[in-house]
Structure formats: C-alpha cells, structure tokens
C-alpha cells in the first residue's frame, strides 16, 4: 500500500521520531507527519539531536549509502527575518513553541545560507552517504528533498511486554512502524505474537488516568511458560539460569517463587525447592517470598522535557494505513528501530500484569541503543 517509516524510535521521555525516505517537497513532508499524528521534527540540542543522529546512523536508505541525502526538518527562516551570520542557526528557527536546549549545541552548516531578509527559506539536514549527519543546508521550500523526519510526543509509553513463551513478535506503532522490537511503545501500539501451538495473541498499549498499560495482557508475560523459569523475559530451563560467574540469572514464572536456596523456583507457598541447589549465592534475586511476580522498575534517565511539540498524538485520532511490504525494497516488513533512553521513568508490572509508566523530568543523558529489527 505505502511505505512505513524506514526507522523509528522512542525515548522514555515520551518523544518518538521516525525517519522516512521519500522524495517530496517541504509542504508535503510536513503534511505527511501531521497525518501520521506528529509534526515535522525539530532537531534541537542534546537528547533530541542524539536521537535523530542515531536514527540516521542505523543504516542507509534505498540508495544504499552511495550519495548524500537531504531530510526535511522543522527549520526555516521566515519571510521577514534576516540571515544572521554570527548566530548558530543563522537566523533560522525551529517551528516549535518550546525554546528547547541551547542553540549553540547544534550541527554546523554544510554551506552558509544566502544573505536575505525577504524570501522565506527552509533548511534540510544533510547526511553524508545517507547515514552520517553533515549539518544544515538551506533549501528552497518548493524543492524536493530525499526524505523527512517526524516527531511525536506522548505523555506515557508502555515498556516492552515480556515474551515468555511467545515467538514471532511484531510491533505495529500508530505512526506507521512495523518492528520486531520496541523497548518503549506509544499508546496505540499493537503487539502480536504466537504462543505455543501457534496460537496467536495480540495486546495493545493503552493510556488511562494511571499511565500506560498493555490491554488484554493476562499475567506478566505475553505467553505463559511451560516451566517455572524466565531469563530476560523469556522462558528458560534451570541449566540455562546460571550466568558466566555461576550466579542465578533467572526469575520465577507466575505461580512460583524463589526457593530458600536462592537459585530455584518452587510452587508459591511451598517454601522448599523442588530442584536441589548447590548453595551458590544469588547475585540477582529476581523475586521475593512475598512477591511471586517481581516488581520491576526501570530507572531511565531523562534528557528532554515533556511536551516539546504542541502535537500530542492520540491513538484513536490519527490512523495511517500500515503496509505489508515497504516500497523501498527491504526484504522484510520489519524496520530498523532506534531507541534512546532519555528519561527518568518508573514502570512497574503489577501483580495483575498491568504496566504503569510515568515520567519524571531530570537532566542527565544516556547513550542511545540501536536495535536492528530486520535481523531480530
């Protein structure tokens, strides 16, 4: 039907970004972002700049990285504004009500913009080989760039559900993204998977007055485990529960709790291990006797304030059709995903299995993590 985002990613702060390879004029790109429920992206200092650069660096577009690419962003100089040679943005400004970070912490200009006080001018982000950001470049608004960047702002996000026995996970985000992995999902994201026996399961991230949670998620995992152990959210057998140092690296599945030996799971209330342990001290006890489902908190650092853009997509407001196959010739329906963890977020899986996620604004930074979902 039409192409998905080439790549997209969300930070724990609630900001999501998507990168699109599509030859179009600035006005059409701006409309494309709005129709997706976002806006043409600002690329301010700090976390936002890092998130966008990470998206670009995740891989070349349809050209295979053979040429420089130009991407529309929400940077322009209005008709009545002059070129300012000594300013970092040269008199251009971001189309956003929030002043954001220091404009001095920005990319360089690939070419100095023409001196003018009359004509409106737009600017693009030039990427060498389509992946390495070179800097800003003035461009007439009616010309066509190679692509564009969108930004979406959400108040809350759902942390990724733990798979358990699930396979073939597929995420469908509301702003046109198919992916096999998404650490943080905006409301409206649908996760589908297969449980044992090829039984399909589907859960949706929904926002309510408490926060964001996975609707229809019974228990704390997508598919219950046949056994009693989980490692990194997936079902595991006891022999696979020892880490390199001999420590117990698993947690107990629903209905089980950590035995007294600290390295095996027993039926809740039993108190004695059904599988013997060697008494190796537990380095990371995943559960307590009072909590069969571990209370999990994600301490994630924040680097940007919430509400950076006036647009706050709502899951049932913006509907964009999602294609079966991206037009730009990728071999699967998956897209490369870029995650930047940039906010102090508290996300808790409650005993009922719902996820509560809220954000507290702080000012520290984090290194973006890349997930290539096409090979996941």
């Amino acid at each position: 039907e039409h192409p998905t985002a080439d790549r997209a990613g969300c930070s724990a702060s609630g900001a999501c970004y998507s990168l699109h390879h599509a030859t179009m004029k600035r006005q059409a790109a701006e409309e494309a972002c709005i129709l997706r429920g976002g806006a043409l992206s600002t690329v301010r200092a700090g976390a936002e700049l890092r998130a966008v650069l990470a998206l670009l660096r995740a891989g070349p577009g349809p050209g295979g990285g053979s040429k420089d690419l130009l991407f529309w962003v929400a940077l322009e100089r209005r008709r009545s504004h002059c070129t300012l040679e000594n300013e970092p943005l040269r008199g251009f400004s971001w189309l956003s009500s929030d002043p954001g970070g220091l404009e001095s912490d920005t990319l360089q200009w690939v070419e100095e913009p023409q001196r003018s006080c009359t004509a409106r001018r737009c600017a693009v982000l030039q990427a060498t080989g389509g992946v390495e950001p070179a800097g800003w470049k003035e461009m007439r608004c009616h010309l066509r760039a190679n692509g564009y960047l969108c930004k979406y702002q959400f108040e809350v996000l759902c942390p990724a559900p733990r798979p358990g026995a699930a396979s073939n996970l597929s995420y469908r985000a509301p702003f046109q993204l198919h992916s096999a992995a998404l650490d943080f999902s905006p409301p409206g994201t649908e996760v589908s998977a297969l449980c044992r026996g090829q039984l399909p399961i589907s859960v949706t991230c929904i926002a309510d007055e408490i926060g964001a949670r996975w609707d229809k998620l019974s228990g704390d995992v997508l598919c219950p485990c046949p056994g009693r152990y989980l490692r990194a959210g997936k079902c595991a057998e006891l022999p696979n529960c020892l880490d390199d140092l001999g420590g117990f690296a698993c947690e107990c599945a629903t209905g089980f709790e950590l035995g007294k030996d600290g390295r095996s799971c027993v039926t809740s209330g039993e108190g004695q291990p059904t599988l013997g342990g060697t008494g190796v001290p537990t380095r990371r006890p995943p559960a307590t006797a009072t909590s069969p489902v571990p209370q999990r908190t994600w301490p994630i650092r924040v680097d940007e304030k919430l509400g950076e853009t006036p647009l706050v997509p709502e899951q049932d407001n913006s509907v964009t059709s999602i294609p079966e196959i991206p037009r730009w010739g990728s071999q699967s329906t998956m897209s490369t995903l870029q995650m930047s963890l940039q906010a102090e977020s508290k996300a808790t899986i409650t005993p009922s299995g719902s996820v509560i996620s809220k954000f507290n604004s702080t000012t520290s930074s984090a290194t973006p993590q890349a997930f290539d979902s096409s090979s996941a």
Epitope: H2, T23, M24, E31, A32, I34, L311, P313, E314, N317
Partner: antibody, heavy 118, light 108 residues
C-alpha cells in the same frame, strides 16, 4: 490552473461498492497530497482521508477505515476512492481536494453525488 | 480528536452591517493550522481564509480573520449580498482534520 474533475452521480444499492475518480490537471500530481471530504445533504464537512500519489502513502480518518480505500494512478493523474458495504449513511457528496502550498485545501473538485437506494 | 464548535449556527445580517462569527476548538490549535471555507448551495467549498488571517486569492478585503489558541473568528466589516453563504472553520493541527459545523449567514 489547478483543476480537479470528478466522476458523475452514482446510484447504488445497499451492500454494494462504488468507485469514484478525480482527474487532476494544472500541477504536478505526484507532488501534492490529495484529500477526500464527505458532505451529507444539508450537513457539514467530514474529512475522510488523504493520499500522496508520489509514493501512494495514505492516511485515513478512523471513522472511514475499512469503508473508504484511496488509490492513485500517476500515469493518468487520477485519484480514486472506493466505498464498500454501502448503507444509507453513505448517501452524500464526496469531494476531492488539492492540498496546496498555503497548507490548506485550496482547490476542490465539483463533487460526486452518491445515492444509496434499494 | 479536536472538536470545532461554530457559533452562531445561523445568523442574519443587514447589508452594510458588521458581521462576526466564531470558531472554538476543544484544545489549542496553532494559528497556522486554522482555515475558513465558504460554501454556497450547490457549489463546492472554497478556501476563504488560510492560517487564521490570510485572505485566499480573490477574497474581498472586507473579510478578516483573527484568533489564537482555542478561539478564532471571521469578520465581515460591511455585509454584502454575495457574502450570504455557509462558512466552515477547519483545523489540521492534529489528525484527523476536523471541520466546524458551519455558520450559515443570511441576508436580513
């Protein structure tokens, strides 16, 4: 000059499907979004969705998802909207509109009137 | 979904009279993304005012638009017979695009 020429009046039965066309001229068809708007008799305007002919990117109002399907043929500069599972609620005039450089729907087709009757 | 409420739904004005109609949004809309359309019976809507205050090509100077945030208005400084029509406000600050219910302006 930008012109949008829409296909003629349609009379259809409940449950059937109809496909209407909008032929564009006077501009580069693949460079601008084409929007579709519904207007029931004596009522206001309702946005259905949009298509970008340059890459067939589409976006729909949730209300019309599954009801309307937007397509475009670049070789003839023609946009199409197909309406399925027709009911009396689909009796309306449907407009195609050009989304222009003023960030608004600056040109409109003359409308296609659809009447559903058994 | 942003709901646009137009008032009054119907109004009548004498020739030469000053006319003002309003459009209230359920949540804030950027002034760049608020437009007005004029529609006469049997005709397609026409872009009348774009980005809150800019007159579309061919629109008489007696028309003006203003507003910000959630409150916008269209004003005719001196009503003329050809101004009798229905006026719709429209936003695209957030998808889906929405229209107001319209204000029908009649000659008194």
């Amino acid at each position: 000059e930008v012109q949008l020429q829409q296909s003629g009046t349609v009379l259809a039965r409940p449950g059937a499907s109809v496909k209407m066309s909008c032929k564009a001229s006077g501009y580069t068809f693949t460079s601008y979004w084409m929007h579709w708007v519904k207007q029931r008799p004596g009522q206001g305007l309702e946005w259905i969705g949009a298509i970008y002919p340059g890459n067939s990117d589409t976006s729909y109002n949730q209300k019309f998802k599954g009801k309307a399907k937007l397509t475009a043929v670049t070789s003839t500069s023609t946009a199409y909207m197909e309406l399925s599972s027709l009911t009396n609620e689909d009796s309306a005039v449907f407009y195609c509109t050009h989304y222009g450089s003023d960030y608004a729907m600056d040109y409109w087709g003359q409308g296609t009137s659809v009447t559903i009757s058994s | 979904q942003i709901v646009l409420t137009q008032s009054p739904a119907i109004m009548s004005a004498s020739l030469g009279e000053r006319v003002t109609m309003t459009c209230t949004a359920s949540s804030s809309v950027s002034s760049s993304y608020l437009h007005w359309y004029q529609q006469k019976p049997g005709s397609s809507p026409k872009l009348w005012i774009y980005s809150t205050s800019n007159l579309a090509s061919g629109v008489p100077a007696r028309f003006s638009g203003s507003g910000s945030g959630t409150s916008y208005s269209l004003t005719i400084s001196s009503m003329e017979a050809e101004d009798a029509a229905t006026y719709y406000c429209h936003q695209y600050h957030r998808s889906p695009r929405t229209f107001g219910g319209g204000t029908k302006l009649e000659i008194k």
